[in-house]
């Protein structure tokens, strides 16, 4: 009987503690949309704790469900600097493996500055979450300003 | 081997469900731009289990990766308001200890009335959280427009 | 000794995994603000796992403190179809029982297209969540751009 | 400490325009808005706008086609112009610093106030 | 437009006495968790003095002989005691919505 309920208990290591929030690193060069990110307690609050990066992208490593979420200020902007240089979109996905290829959050900036919102997604081990920024605005590298994080929320 | 393997469970009580919602009390005095906010559900759908208020400000009672999240939105506004009193914005921070200080999240308003954002950070145990407005617009205390909010994530 | 320690371990049901997310199924006749959501895995990346869906509404299954989240993102919308068309507004509350009835979470488009926040409530088995969008504007079907979802945070 | 002193003359001939000068001290216009009102026997109080700290302003409707509140930031001077006076505009008018919060609309000090008689 | 009433157009009332002046708006002057309802008071020759903003919150300076009070369209300006500098006329003044508009006045006399 006790060993019937030792059995359901939750292990420690399989309580999915992944999580990641990375600061902006760079933009790629003009024709590649994608937002570059670093993580690491060296460079200040951010850090990777299952996830990783790959050249700048971060890819998953634990099967989940997963709360993603983002915040992208543009640099040195006013409320008519986005309308000026409209369209400015943000849209993070799967973009790799190539099979598995899909917005899944996509936010415009219209006449704002910021953009930030955050959704449950499943995603799978080898997942790779690009951010891409199209238009022709530079955002802020603040890291109180720009961060995209990922946590693990269930199997 | 049975023994090591309840050592490796979790115990309820380090799960660490720290977790609080707040609702805005007041704006400080003139010099001021903290929010001051107030929970427990004596006041509605606010309360505080793990982290506690200090003169209207949050302090963070565990160690852990936490989500913060804030909704902001100023009083009888409408998409002309915020760009009469710009800039208007919003900063999250650790503002004590005083060693700890750092701005965590930080949205302007433009032409908008409403900011909404959050992010995952480290906190530590006597952290305490700041929301500093900044401008000379009065936020909404309505409690579905207004509202500040920790989760412990992680170790 | 032991099974004083065994009897603090947290069992994996009690977890309450519960979590949903949910994609835009279609908005209700003229004098219905609501939003009728869908979801599940043959629809994409939308899915329930403990909560239920009634008639488009969202119906919580277990009690607990919940993280709410949405973005809706109006169709075919430029920086001036928001103003143009004032006020359009999106509530998120609880909309049954009729005793529990709050709005728990409301948002102005002014001149954006998009919304999106979340915050932290009690929710108790039962409760059934509506979305208001009040306005004249439809809101946008694609899965990446309006969403909306719970997850529970602890009991 | 905080002032508004005006200046404007006190008889205007009718179909002509009234202009104020505002010159505030104690205070920045870039911080606070600064509103107009007028008080006349017949009306009482009666708002007739606003300029706000970023510029902008605000009109009540029956005034916005023939009134005019500009400043200058770094004379610290708001100035008032309203065209096609006719006898009902007789009024004292009076600028007025908005409170520190901007969207509070309440008016925390007061000018002196500028007795205007419409009259040929 | 939001119409305020006064009433009393005037009272009179006895040194060390309370003096009670109701403002009604025609429609409720609350939103965002505020009630935007403040009062002046003007002596003759003049400008008006901000009171109380906000129904209840003091303006800086002012007597704590002044109180404010009510909610959503009812409003009520109490001075107790009122003393000698009192005599004025008073003006309730909402601020939920432009136009911004002002009650036509009460003038308190001192018997």
């Known amino acids: 009987q006790r060993f019937a309920q030792a059995q359901q208990q939750l292990p420690l290591e399989s309580l999915g503690w992944d999580v990641a929030e990375l600061q902006l690193n760079h933009t790629g060069p003009q024709q590649d949309p994608r937002l570059y990110w670093q993580g690491g307690p060296a460079l200040g609050r951010s850090f990777l704790h299952g996830p990783e990066l790959d050249k700048g992208q971060l890819r998953i490593h634990r099967d989940g469900i997963y709360m993603v979420h983002i915040q992208v200020t543009l640099a040195i902007c006013s409320s008519t600097t986005a309308s000026r240089h409209h369209p400015t979109t943000l849209a993070v996905g799967i973009c790799s493996p190539a099979s598995r290829s899909i917005s899944l959050l996509r936010l415009s900036f219209h006449q704002g500055c910021t953009i930030a919102s955050q959704r449950l997604t499943p995603l799978a081990r080898g997942d790779t979450l690009c951010t891409n920024l199209t238009g022709t605005l530079l955002p802020s590298r603040n890291t109180d300003e720009t961060f995209f994080g990922v946590q693990w929320v269930r199997p | 081997q049975r023994f090591a393997q309840a050592q490796q469970q979790l115990p309820l009580e380090s799960l660490g469900w720290d977790v609080a919602e707040l609702q805005l009390n007041h704006t400080g005095p003139q010099q001021d731009p903290r929010l001051y906010w107030q929970g427990g559900p004596a006041l509605g759908r606010s309360f505080l289990h793990g982290p506690e208020l200090d003169k209207g400000q949050l302090r963070i009672h565990r160690d852990g990766i936490y989500m913060v999240h804030i909704q902001v939105t100023l009083a009888i506004c409408s998409s002309t308001t915020a760009s009469r009193h710009h800039p208007t914005t919003l900063a999250v921070g650790i503002c004590s200890p005083a060693s700890r200080s750092i701005s965590l999240l930080r949205l302007s308003f433009h032409q908008g009335c409403t900011i909404a954002s959050q992010r995952l950070t480290p906190l530590a145990r006597g952290d305490t959280l700041c929301t500093n407005l900044t401008g000379t617009l009065l936020p909404s205390r309505n409690t579905d427009e207004t509202f500040f909010g920790v989760q412990w994530v992680r170790p | 000794q032991r099974f004083a320690q065994a009897q603090q371990q947290l069992p994996l049901e009690s977890l309450g995994w519960d979590v949903a997310e949910l994609q835009l199924n279609h908005t209700g006749p003229q004098q219905d603000p609501r939003l009728y959501w869908q979801g599940g895995p043959a629809l994409g990346r939308s899915f329930l796992h403990g909560p239920e869906l009634d008639k488009g509404q969202l119906r919580i299954h277990r009690d607990g403190i919940y993280m709410v989240h949405i973005q809706v993102t109006l169709a075919i919308c430029s920086s001036t179809t928001a103003s143009r068309h004032h006020p359009t507004t999106l509530a998120v509350g609880i909309c049954s029982p009729a005793s529990r009835s709050i709005s728990l979470l409301r948002l102005s488009f002014h001149q954006g297209c998009t919304i999106a926040s979340q915050r932290l409530t009690p929710l108790a088995r039962g409760d059934t969540l509506c979305t208001n969008l009040t306005g004249t504007l439809l809101p946008s079907r694609n899965t990446d751009e309006t969403f909306f979802g719970v997850q529970w945070v602890r009991p | 400490q905080v002032q508004l002193k005006q200046s404007g003359p006190g008889l205007v001939q009718p179909s002509q325009s009234l202009s104020i000068t505002c010159t505030v001290s104690?205070?920045?216009?870039?911080?606070?808005?600064v509103h107009w009102v007028r008080q006349s026997p017949g009306k009482g109080l009666e708002w007739l706008g606003v300029i706000w700290s970023a510029g902008i302003t605000d009109y009540n409707a029956p005034f916005i086609s023939r009134l005019s509140i500009t400043k200058d930031n770094s004379k610290s001077q708001v100035f008032f112009k309203m065209n096609s006076l006719q006898a009902d505009d007789t009024a004292i008018y009076y600028c007025a610093r908005n409170d520190y919060y901007g969207n509070l609309y309440a008016m925390d000090y007061w000018g002196q106030g500028t007795s205007v008689t419409v009259s040929s | 437009d939001i119409v305020l009433t006064q009433s009393p157009a005037s009272l009179a009332v006895s040194l060390g006495q309370r003096a009670t002046i109701s403002c009604r708006a025609n429609?409720?002057?609350?939103?965002?968790?505020?009630?935007?309802m403040h009062w002046y008071q003007q002596k003759p020759g003049q400008p008006p003095k901000l009171l109380i903003y906000?129904?209840?919150n003091l303006a800086s300076g002012v007597p704590a002989r002044f109180s404010g009070s009510g909610s959503g369209t009812d409003f009520t300006l109490n001075i107790h005691p009122v003393e000698g500098e009192d005599a004025a006329t008073y003006y309730c003044?909402?601020?939920?919505?432009?136009?911004?508009?002002f009650g036509a006045g009460t003038k308190l006399e001192l018997k």
């Open positions: 003044q909402h601020s939920r919505e432009f136009p911004l508009t």
């Open positions: 906000l129904v209840s």
């Open positions: 104690g205070f920045s216009l870039t911080t606070y808005g």
């Open positions: 429609k409720s002057v609350s939103a965002s968790g505020y009630t935007f």
